[in-house]
Amino acid sequence: PEPPTACREKQYLINSQCCSLCQPGQKLVSDCTEFTETECLPCGESEFLDTWNRETHCHQHKYCDPNLGLRVQQKGTSETDTICTCEEGWHCTSEACESCVLHRSCSPGFGVKQIATGVSDTICEPCPVGFFSNVSSAFEKCHPWTSCETKDLVVQQAGTNKTDVVCGPQDRLRA
C-alpha cells in the first residue's frame, strides 16, 4: 500500500508511517516502527506536558519565587503548569505577573485614594486643608480635623496635613 501523507488526529507522520502521539503528561522515548508502538514515559516530578505531543523533554513547572513576592496559587500536575500569584499585600509588576512588589504605603500628609489590588498599586493623594494623616499606611484615608466647636471647645493648635487640631477649653470671661 501507498505510504500515508497525512495521519489521523493524535498521530504524527515519521519514516512514512503514522505513529501515535504521546498523551498529555508523557514524553516521547522512541517513535513507533512497523512492529512496535510509540514508546512514551511519564513526565518527572515538577515537569509537565499539556498536549498530545512528540516532545522528548517535558517542560519544567513555573517557579513561584518567594523572593519575587510570588506564591503557588495552583500546584502543577504532569499535565498542567503551576499557576503563581502575588503574596497577600503584594501586586504584579507586569501583565504576565512574573514578579510582584509590596503595596506602596502613603506617607504622613497623604491618604489612600485607592487601595491596591493584586494587579495595581496603592494610589495616594495629598490630604487637603481640613484633613490629615499622621501615619504611613496602605489603607488609611485622610481623616478630617476634629471639630472643636461641636465639643464646645476651641482650637488651641491649628491642624496640618500631618496633624490633627488640638482643642482646649474656652477661656471663661471673668465678671
Epitope: D65, N67, L68, T93, V101, L102
Partner: antibody, heavy 117, light 107 residues
Framework: EVQLVQSGAEVKKPGASVKVSCKAS????????IEWVRQAPGQGLEWMGN????????KYNEKFKGRVTLTADKSTSTAYMELSRLRSEDTAVYYC??????????WGQGTTVTVSS | DIQMTQSPSSLSASVGDRVTISCRAS??????LNWYQQKPGKVPKLLIY???RLRSGVPSRFSGSGSGTDYTLTISSLQPEDVATYYC?????????FGQGTKLEIK
C-alpha cells in the same frame, strides 16, 4: 534574548568611588530586580545587594551598607552600582544579574575594578 | 547570615566518572538552594534551582538533591566540558550567600 551589558574596566585609587553600569535589553526592565555580586581574584562569589526598578526597592548586604548605592535609570533600562571609599580589598570583578523567572538567570559579562595606589 | 560550606574544595575525576559535590547550610534553608557553574574566565551560569530543578538546556547528567541543611550536586558521567568551579547559593534568607566553590578538574 535577555542581555545585560556592563561598563568597562576601571582603575581607582584608595578612597575614591566607582560607578558600574549594567544595561538591560530583551525584556521589560521594570519587571524584575537586578542583583549585584562581586568576585575577588581567585575567590568565591559575594552578594552585595539588589534593586527593583519597578519601585526603587533596595536591599543591601550589611557588609557594604553605607558604602554601596544601587540606582537605575528606567528611561535607558540601566542599573548602577556605586561603591565609595574604595580600598585594595575591593579589587574584584563586579557582576550584575537578573532575578528573573529563575534566580540569577542572566548575568552581565562582569566589570573589573582595580584599586591601587 | 546563613553560612554555606561546600566540600570538597577541589576534586579531580576521570571522564565518565560519577561526581558528587556537597553543600551544607548553617540552618534549614527549606530547599531554596541553587547551583552555578563557572568555567575558567567565564561568567557564572545557573544550572539547578530549588534543590533539584534542572534549568532548561542543562544536560540531564546534572542533578541535585537534598533537604534541610544538606544538599548535593551530582554529575552522573563526567564530560571534559564540565571542568569548572561549582557554587551553591542559598535563596532562603537575605543576604544571599554562596558556598566557597568546588573546583572540578579532569584526571
Amino acid at each position: 534574548e535577555v542581555q545585560l551589558v556592563q561598563s568597562g574596566a576601571e582603575v581607582k585609587k584608595p578612597g575614591a568611588s566607582v560607578k558600574v553600569s549594567c544595561k538591560a535589553s530583551g525584556y521589560t526592565f521594570t519587571t524584575f530586580p537586578i542583583e549585584w555580586v562581586r568576585q575577588a581574584p581567585g575567590q568565591g562569589l559575594e552578594w552585595m545587594g539588589n534593586f527593583h526598578p519597578y519601585n526603587d526597592d533596595t536591599k543591601y548586604n550589611e557588609k557594604f551598607k553605607g558604602r554601596v548605592t544601587l540606582t537605575a535609570d528606567k528611561s535607558t533600562s540601566t542599573a548602577y552600582m556605586e561603591l565609595s571609599r574604595l580600598r585594595s580589598e575591593d579589587t574584584a570583578v563586579y557582576y550584575c544579574a537578573r532575578r528573573g523567572k529563575l534566580p540569577f538567570d542572566s548575568w552581565g559579562q562582569g566589570t573589573t575594578v582595580t584599586v591601587s595606589s | 547570615d546563613i553560612q554555606m560550606t561546600q566540600s570538597p574544595s577541589s576534586l579531580s575525576a576521570s571522564v565518565g566518572d560519577r561526581v558528587t559535590i556537597s553543600c551544607r547550610a548553617s540552618q534549614d534553608i527549606s530547599n531554596y538552594l541553587n547551583w552555578y557553574q563557572q568555567k575558567p574566565g567565564k561568567v557564572p551560569k545557573l544550572l539547578i534551582y530549588f534543590t533539584s530543578r534542572l534549568r532548561s538546556g542543562v544536560p540531564s547528567r546534572f542533578s541535585g538533591s537534598g533537604s534541610g541543611t544538606d544538599y548535593t550536586l551530582t554529575i552522573s558521567s563526567l564530560q571534559p566540558e564540565d571542568v569548572a568551579t561549582y557554587y551553591c547559593q542559598q535563596d532562603r534568607k537575605l543576604p544571599w550567600t554562596f558556598g566557597q566553590g568546588t573546583k572540578l578538574e579532569i584526571k
